[in-house]
């Protein structure tokens, strides 16, 4: 489940140029826009993912209150600077010189600033929660039905670990799912939580990232699963900073 | 570490059983845990898996609704089967993931037989 | 997600060599494994990842394949490899019948 040898792609990005360049002629994958070698064994990281969207064509309440400090993402797409592992530098810049901090999954989590804007760490975002409204069905879903199914696919689908799920919410419409992954937690080879959110996301959206893999097809004893809304907040080791007059 | 199945019996038709599998110098909460049973002179048969985070059990579609699965203390985890045949005459193993996202199993206990007969 | 594999049964000499090989009724994207089982004894993984080799097992054991199609290689045959061996695909559990192949006997004469 590295690079496919047969016919040279990556399976789990399609966002990548392939060839037989490797050692021994193996098959190498390089993302587009970073043109960095991707494990094709593992999802890519969503710096990676983002800089190659932006370079390609453009075409009794059970549910969690997001703190204070969540974040959601309002910012959009743009084009990041990802360091030599894949992941988000701290500081963003835009071409005019208006820079800012993000989080590790590239969140902006500052005020926008100057040049003279200092990001000194980048700040893990360990907790996110999923929130989607699914389309009417007959009837609520199952409650453990879907929490085993929405496991399931995180670690199938995304290999994520179901510790890494901590909890699956449901009151009808709204699903939640809860990512929590702290650094100490997270060994060498595990999926980031931010990614496999990312990769969740646009398989929401109908736009999936995998190679040759069908698109999402998520049902509960035979009941598709269909999402209207998705909506994502990010919480972070430690707390934005944002000025006061955001929050107006 | 180690996995030790308890439980197997000689049974008539129609009666419930549960076996347990006690694990042994791990933590259990890092791995999913399966039960797979051969029936004498044949081949592995999936029955069913716990992810321990969360608790969720998954089934071979054969086995959904006679068969569960869950973890009763930090240790074990029993696999209870209700309306028992003969066809469930097996020994019945309980084996541990590799701690991964895929169902690699690196760790099996010696298994446990099960014998269903008047 | 149906695993067959062939043959049931095969016979080779010491320092022979034999095949095995398993196909996923569906693409399994080489998350496929191999175990050993001698009689009285639970399965011991032999290899993962279609190719990778278990700890502590030797290297004339060699995985392959991808897609839907894999095989297992057992070159220089010794007594101690007679045994039964499953492939099982390690990709998905959700709707399935089994995981495991259906065996190969492995007699070395």
């Known amino acids: 489940h590295t690079a496919a040898q047969d016919n040279c792609t990556c399976p789990t990005n399609k966002m990548t140029v392939c060839s037989p360049d490797g050692p021994g002629g193996r098959c190498q994958c390089r993302a587009l826009g970073s043109g960095m070698a991707v494990d094709c064994s593992t999802l890519t990281s969503k710096c990676l993912l983002l800089k190659a969207r932006m370079s390609a064509p453009k075409n009794a309440r059970t549910l969690v209150r997001p703190s204070e400090h969540a974040l959601v993402d309002n910012d959009g797409l743009y084009d990041p600077d990802c360091d030599p592992e894949g992941r988000f530098k701290a500081r963003q810049c835009n071409q005019t010189s208006v820079c800012w901090c993000v989080n590790s999954v590239g969140v902006r989590r500052t005020d926008k600033g100057d040049l003279s804007l200092r990001c000194d760490e980048l700040v893990r975002t360990h907790h996110i929660l999923i929130d989607l409204r699914h389309r009417p069905t007959a009837g609520a879903f199952n409650h453990s039905d879907l929490d085993a199914e929405l496991r399931r696919l995180f670690r199938e689908r995304y290999r994520l670990h179901p510790k890494f799920v901590a909890a699956v919410h449901y009151e009808q419409p709204t699903i939640q799912i809860e990512l929590r992954q702290n650094t100490s937690q997270k060994a060498a080879g595990d999926v980031d939580i931010g990614d496999a959110a990312y990769y969740f996301e646009r398989d929401i959206k109908g736009e999936s990232l995998f190679q040759g893999r069908g698109g999402l097809d998520l049902r509960v004893r035979g009941e598709p699963l269909q999402v209207e809304r998705t909506l994502i907040y990010y919480l972070d080791e430690i707390p934005p900073k944002f000025s006061m007059k955001r929050l107006t | 570490q180690s996995l030790e199945e308890s439980g197997g019996d000689l049974v008539q038709p129609g009666a419930s059983l549960t076996l347990t599998c006690k694990a042994s110098?791990?933590?259990?909460?890092?791995?999913?845990m399966l039960w797979v049973r051969q029936a004498p002179g044949k081949g592995l048969e999936w029955i069913g898996c716990?992810?321990?985070?969360?608790?969720?059990t998954y089934f071979a579609s054969w086995a959904t609704g006679r068969f569960a699965i869950s973890k009763t203390s930090s240790t074990t985890v029993t696999l209870q089967m209700t309306s028992l045949t003969a066809a469930d005459t097996a020994t019945y193993f309980c084996?541990?993931?590799?701690?991964?996202?895929?169902?690699?199993?690196?760790?099996w206990g010696p298994g446990t037989l099960v014998t269903v007969s008047s | 997600y149906d695993m067959t594999q062939t043959p049931a049964s095969v016979s080779a000499a010491v320092g022979g060599t034999v095949t095995i090989k398993c196909q996923a009724s569906?693409?399994?994207?080489?998350?496929l494994a191999w175990y050993q089982q001698k009689p009285g004894q639970p399965p011991k993984l032999l290899i993962y990842?279609?190719?990778d080799l278990a700890s502590g097992v030797p290297s004339r054991f060699k995985g392959s394949g991808s897609g839907t199609e894999y095989t297992l290689t057992i070159s220089a045959l010794e007594c101690d490899d007679a045994a039964t061996y499953y492939c099982?695909?390690?990709?998905?559990?959700?709707?399935?019948?089994?995981?495991f192949g259906g065996g190969t006997e492995v007699v070395v004469k």
């Open positions: 099982q695909q390690a990709y998905t559990i959700g709707n399935i019948d089994n995981t």
């Open positions: 990842d279609a190719s």
């Open positions: 084996a541990r993931d590799d701690g991964s996202t895929s169902y690699y199993l690196n760790l």
């Open positions: 716990i992810y321990i985070s969360g608790g969720t």
């Open positions: 110098g791990f933590d259990l909460n890092n791995y999913a």
């Open positions: 569906e693409d399994i994207y080489s998350l």
